[in-house]
């Protein structure tokens, strides 16, 4: 990697300057794409900040940028004006250039902020040169708020500063009035005044009357050393503008402004809704606006004018629809700082806000809303509803256009059909079931963000409060006992004070759920079951006949049961029991209680176990002899021989 360019940036005080390829230009011997030449800001500027033109100019400091972004003029340095005057200030940025696999290169970018530079944004080289407004035929003090050369003094080292002053030499006098210093008029024989006299409030302009034409004076300002000696240092020649206003003049009244809303990259006319004033004694063409500070999201242009930005326009331009805002690619809102004047009153500050609308928004739905069965309710989060466009939209508002069928949405505990992203993020928006007849629901919302809308459907599912233990593979051709070691809704029973019941929705593909007889005297064999209860599981009354896949050699396979679980006062939930099956292996210990084993293996299994007096199923098989109901195989055969 190599780094070219001057690595110096000259910035006008208080202005924004893009980094350019003249300033910073990286290249690699491999001819790497500028997008892949990455700068990391190791130490940011002290006198200002670095930011990206198309990202939030009020956000966090820029940490990374690419050479491509430098080429595009998107990396900007903004100098922040200090409270104390200065003539020249220096700032540095420490950067690290990287583009693997090349070694990183450290770089320092020097920034010079100087009043010496010619600045289109700032025609004066003085700390202040704002001009003066004076009523016709009257007088007004020229204070340091209007004219201030403190920055020239700031070029002198502070120990000697008290011995120095700034001498203003008037090179062209006002034509419609007089300048006075300590009540003495200035004239060709005495054309000077000092910064110290200005600071003491001794400089006055007196208008001579006879009209409201513009006035002003030209001057040269330079440093003056001890005992009035001229010293080398900064100097400037400028004009000071004096505006004479009609004493009868009523100042214009700015009207409330509505932000301009525009999609990025487009153009929109500025109307009176954005910029208007009430001024009964001025024509629209006499009301002038000047752009003091423009945002980074676009510029103002005049129809019929050049394609570039305009800094001056009139109310007539606005009223006729000639003034337009041209948005660039930025998605960030911005504000124009303007000054408005009717030419006879002091300028008034005004602002024009520009809100960049997304061309489209999208509601991101990352997951359905899962409602825990025993709770019957759940808070929405950004997982369910989040609006994005070219950026995240935290201000999004939602309105239900189709409510849920089996429940309702609550905000702060009360049913609501409208809510905000903020309420979602704070967990205040809750879906609660009110009708416990479905394990699913959905609702449709319309999302609105920055004037654009989009709709989305939020799906709701109930998460079963059911403990499922499938364990290792189960033997094909066997009947195993379905009990709470496999399916257990005991916690749901405790939470609802009811006996949960199950409905078989689907499966198994190879096999069936059966009810096994309680005693030998009970008639018939295993009955096919489609519904059962937690009590049936606890009583050991249920069996799962694990079938063999048809039409192929015995082999391991997967199967499942899909169940709907119901309990009082809560919504039903769908759950599944997924299990693996394999051909029966008599030598293998199975982790479930077997009620029967396949026919062929039964005769080889050795002596039957002794009968248990209770008639309960025997212990789980832990040896080649499987445990079976009624304490042995003969008991099982006897009980089931007519099935």
């Amino acid at each position: 990697l190599s780094l070219e360019g001057s690595r110096t940036l000259t910035v006008c005080p208080g202005s924004v300057q893009p980094l350019s390829s003249q300033t910073l230009r990286a290249s690699s011997s491999a001819g790497t794409d500028p997008q892949l030449l990455l700068y990391r800001v190791v130490r940011g500027p002290q006198l200002g900040r670095l930011f990206h033109a198309q990202q939030d100019s009020t956000g966090e400091a820029l940490v990374n940028f690419t050479q491509a972004e430098v080429y595009a003029g998107n990396i900007l340095y903004e100098h922040e004006m200090p409270t104390e005057p200065f003539w020249e200030a220096h700032d540095t940025l420490e950067l690290q250039l990287s583009s693997p696999p090349a070694r990183d290169v450290a770089a320092t970018l020097a920034v010079a902020v100087s009043f010496e530079a010619a600045c289109p944004q700032r025609p004066s080289h003085l700390w202040k040169n704002k001009g003066l407004w004076v009523p016709e035929g009257q007088r007004a003090k020229i204070t340091m708020a209007a004219l201030d050369a403190s920055n020239l003094l700031a070029s002198v080292p502070s120990p000697q500063r008290l011995e120095h002053d700034v001498l203003f030499q008037v090179t062209q006098f006002p034509s419609r009035g007089q300048l006075l210093v300590s009540e003495e008029p200035l004239h060709a024989g005495q054309p000077h005044f000092l910064q110290s006299q200005l600071a003491a409030g001794q400089l006055v302009y007196a208008h001579g009357g006879g009209g409201t034409q513009q006035d002003g004076f030209h001057f040269r300002a330079h440093l003056q050393g001890p005992a009035g000696a001229t010293v080398a240092g900064p100097q400037t020649s400028e004009a000071f503008a004096i505006t004479v206003r009609d004493v009868n003049e009523r100042p214009p009244q700015p009207q409330a402004s509505v932000p301009l809303r525009i999609t990025r990259g487009s153009r929109a006319p500025i109307s009176r809704a954005q910029l208007s004033v009430v001024d009964p004694d001025s024509a629209p063409g006499e009301i002038e606006y000047e752009v003091q500070r423009a945002p980074h999201n676009g510029f103002l242009s005049l129809v019929g004018g050049g394609p570039g930005p305009v800094t001056h326009f009139t109310q007539a331009d606005v009223d006729s629809g000639r003034l337009a805002f041209v948005a660039n690619g930025s998605s960030v809102a911005g504000v124009f700082q303007l000054s408005m004047s009717d030419g006879a009153s002091p300028p008034l500050p005004m602002s024009l806000a520009v809100d960049i609308l997304p061309s489209a928004i999208e509601v991101q739905l990352q997951a359905p809303l899962e409602v825990p069965q025993a709770l019957g309710r759940s808070s929405l989060s950004q997982q369910q509803l989040r609006v994005v466009s070219d950026r995240e939209e935290p201000e999004a508002a939602y309105r239900l256009i189709q409510g849920p069928k089996y429940g309702h949405l609550l905000v702060g505990g009360r049913p609501a059909s409208a809510f905000s992203q903020l309420q979602i993020d704070q967990g205040e928006v809750v879906f609660a079931f009110t009708n416990f007849s479905s394990s699913h629901d959905h609702f449709r919302v319309l999302a609105l963000a920055r004037g654009v809308n989009a709709s989305a459907v939020v799906n709701i599912t109930v998460r079963a409060l059911l403990h499922v233990w499938a364990g290792g593979p189960w033997p094909q051709g066997a009947t195993l006992r379905l009990d709470p070691t496999i399916l257990d809704a005991g916690e749901l029973a405790n939470r609802t004070g009811s006996v949960p019941h199950f409905r078989l929705l689907e499966g198994p593909r190879h096999g069936r759920v059966v009810r096994v007889p309680r005693a030998r005297t009970e008639p018939g064999g295993s009955q096919l079951v489609e519904q059962f209860t937690q009590q049936d599981l606890e009583d050991g009354r249920l069996g799962l006949e694990v079938g063999r896949p048809e039409g192929r050699a015995p082999s391991p396979t997967g199967d499942s049961l899909t169940l709907e679980l119901w309990a009082q006062g809560v919504p039903p939930a769908v759950a599944s029991l997924d299990f693996a099956t394999e051909p029966y292996n008599a030598a293998r210990p199975y982790s479930v209680a077997l009620l029967s084993v396949p026919e062929a293996t039964r005769m080889e299994a050795g002596k039957p176990e002794s009968s248990t007096p209770t008639g309960e199923p025997g212990p789980m098989a832990s040896s080649p002899v499987p445990a079976v109901a009624k304490g042995g195989f003969l008991g099982f055969l006897e009980a089931n021989m007519f099935s």
Partner: antibody, heavy 112, light 107 residues
Framework: QVQLQESGPGLVKPSQTLSLTCTVS?????????WNWIRQHPGKGLEWIGY???????NYNPSLKSRVTISRDTSKNQFSLKLSSVTAADTAVYYC?????WGQGTLVTVSS | DIQMTQSPSSLSASVGDRVTITCRAS??????LNWYQQKPGKAPKLLIY???SLHSGVPSRFSGSGSGTDFTLTISSLQPEDFATYYC?????????FGQGTKVEIK
Amino acid sequence: QVQLQESGPGLVKPSQTLSLTCTVSGGSITDGYYWNWIRQHPGKGLEWIGYITFDGRNNYNPSLKSRVTISRDTSKNQFSLKLSSVTAADTAVYYCADFDYWGQGTLVTVSS
Amino acid sequence: DIQMTQSPSSLSASVGDRVTITCRASRGIREYLNWYQQKPGKAPKLLIYYTGSLHSGVPSRFSGSGSGTDFTLTISSLQPEDFATYYCQQYSELPWTFGQGTKVEIK
């Protein structure tokens, strides 16, 4: 603040259909969530009859479901109750409400 | 349906008394409970929603608490305008149901 006002005949003959309308002001019926009808038999407690939601879905009390219809007219900002085959046991004060706010109620007497 | 049972059915109290009315649900309703006040010949007025949230314009002497099946409405210092009948109502499960009411009378 939302205001509700019931209107309809105060006397209905047995076996006929009781019809009441609720006019909503100060808000839209597409904004509130539930628009309910509730009744109160003389000297007794409150009984929920049913609701219509902001998007036009209904739910009724199972004890009255076979006889009740609640509908709405969004253009007039109104919702209505129809209760068919009435008997003297349907004599009550009928209220429309969104639960936060209630109409003042209208007494309906079922008598020949 | 969920049954809502209020107790007592009626009570006599004096101005300034602390009054407590309870409401029991036949099964859990989480916090989805409203309390209403009704005066003779008038419509009910919402006092408290979501068990303990005060409706706008309701004096702070009214408060609600509870969760699940047992709920309480408390009037910290009874005022003359508080003599009325009070109803609880659940909105956890359809159909919505009301308690039978508690009449607060002047002793």
